[in-house]
């Protein structure tokens, strides 16, 4: 879903049961620690020397919804995610490095603690390099492992 096409779209939804109060996880993993802003996430990544994983998504996007369920239910993903600084965003930041090939959702971008965007860690779709679908969960797991191999910083 290209979010530049439909910004501010409303979600036609009615929950079938009362939900818990919304948290920063937004359903991507309630047991994980999520940061609130990009600035906070960058600071935490640098100071903790943990890579940052940023998930761009939209509530009203079916593919965001589908990926979210698989991500949240996959035990390996959730376990590995503990080693990251985590941020999920339902809006775009002003940092163009977070949309190297467009502002589509869902997309997942990794940032090294050296504050280098890992544009080299891509999914399988040539037209949307940072997009993942539920069938790509094994690839996402591999890419998370790649991101954990930190870039060497010059002394």
């Amino acid at each position: 879903k290209d979010i530049t096409v439909k910004s501010g779209a409303k979600k036609d939804t009615k929950d079938s049961a009362p939900k818990l109060p919304q948290t920063l996880s937004r359903g991507w993993g309630d047991q994980l620690i999520w940061t609130q802003t990009y600035e906070e996430a960058l600071y935490k990544s640098k100071t903790s020397n943990k890579p940052l994983m940023i998930i761009h998504h939209l509530d009203e996007c079916p593919h965001s919804q589908a990926l979210k369920k698989v991500f949240a239910e996959n035990k390996e993903i959730q376990k590995l995610a503990e080693q990251f600084v985590l941020l999920n965003l339902v809006y775009e930041t002003t940092d163009k490095h977070l949309s190297p090939d467009g502002q589509y959702v869902p997309r997942i971008i990794f940032v090294d603690p050296s504050l280098t965007v890992r544009a080299d860690i891509t999914g399988r779709y040539s037209n949307r390099l940072y997009a993942y679908e539920p069938s790509d969960i094994a690839l996402l797991l591999d890419n998370m492992k790649k991101a954990l191999k930190l870039l060497k910083t010059e002394l």
């Epitope: 036609d12 009615k14 049961a17 069938s135």
Partner: antibody
Framework: QVQLVQSGAEVKKPGASVKVSCKTS????????MNWVRQAPGQGLEWIGW????????NYNGKFKDRVTLTADKSTSTVYMELSSLRSEDTAVYFC?????????????WGQGTLVTVSS | DIQMTQSPSSLSASVGDRVTITCKAS??????LSWFQQKPGKAPKTLIY???RLVDGVPSRFSGSGSGQDFTLTISSLQPEDIATYYC?????????FGGGTKVEIK
Amino acid sequence: QVQLVQSGAEVKKPGASVKVSCKTSGYVFSRSWMNWVRQAPGQGLEWIGWIYPGDGDTNYNGKFKDRVTLTADKSTSTVYMELSSLRSEDTAVYFCARGGYDGSPWLSYWGQGTLVTVSS
Amino acid sequence: DIQMTQSPSSLSASVGDRVTITCKASQDINSYLSWFQQKPGKAPKTLIYRANRLVDGVPSRFSGSGSGQDFTLTISSLQPEDIATYYCLQYDEFPFTFGGGTKVEIK
């Protein structure tokens, strides 16, 4: 193998409600989206909404939002579609259709359909 | 809502003919398009998803192509059992929307 078995035909009066069931088997019920689609006599297909049985999350076509409720019962691996304030134009065959086996949104398997007739 | 325009609305072809049905979306839907076959009195059957991926068990004479706004379903060699109505569906955005259908008959 995957099976979606829907409840039998219903005849309802205008203003009434109808609840159609779709009993599933042959896959992990909680991890595939379930869609509902309808088809009026001699007409095309129309998407009503979907539900994720794992946690009950739903999304509805705005056309039906105020009248439709999708629910799931994990104990019986059954999803339900309830449509209220029925009118004659709701006369249609209602289908449940499971999403992809891996949690993808595409519609993979279909139930046999349930004819709902609304007539005074 | 995204509009899906399917053409032709009906066609008549001979057994063995190559048949092409097109679907045009009112906006870019990436590759999030499926094709279904429906025979009278039956539920639809899914043939293709993600524009070009063939569902297990569907004969290889069926194929899908396209991305963005323009999509095609091709039956490479029409068989008598292919007589049906064919529908496309976009699932890029809520609400999912179907094309109006193409009725395929044998000459």
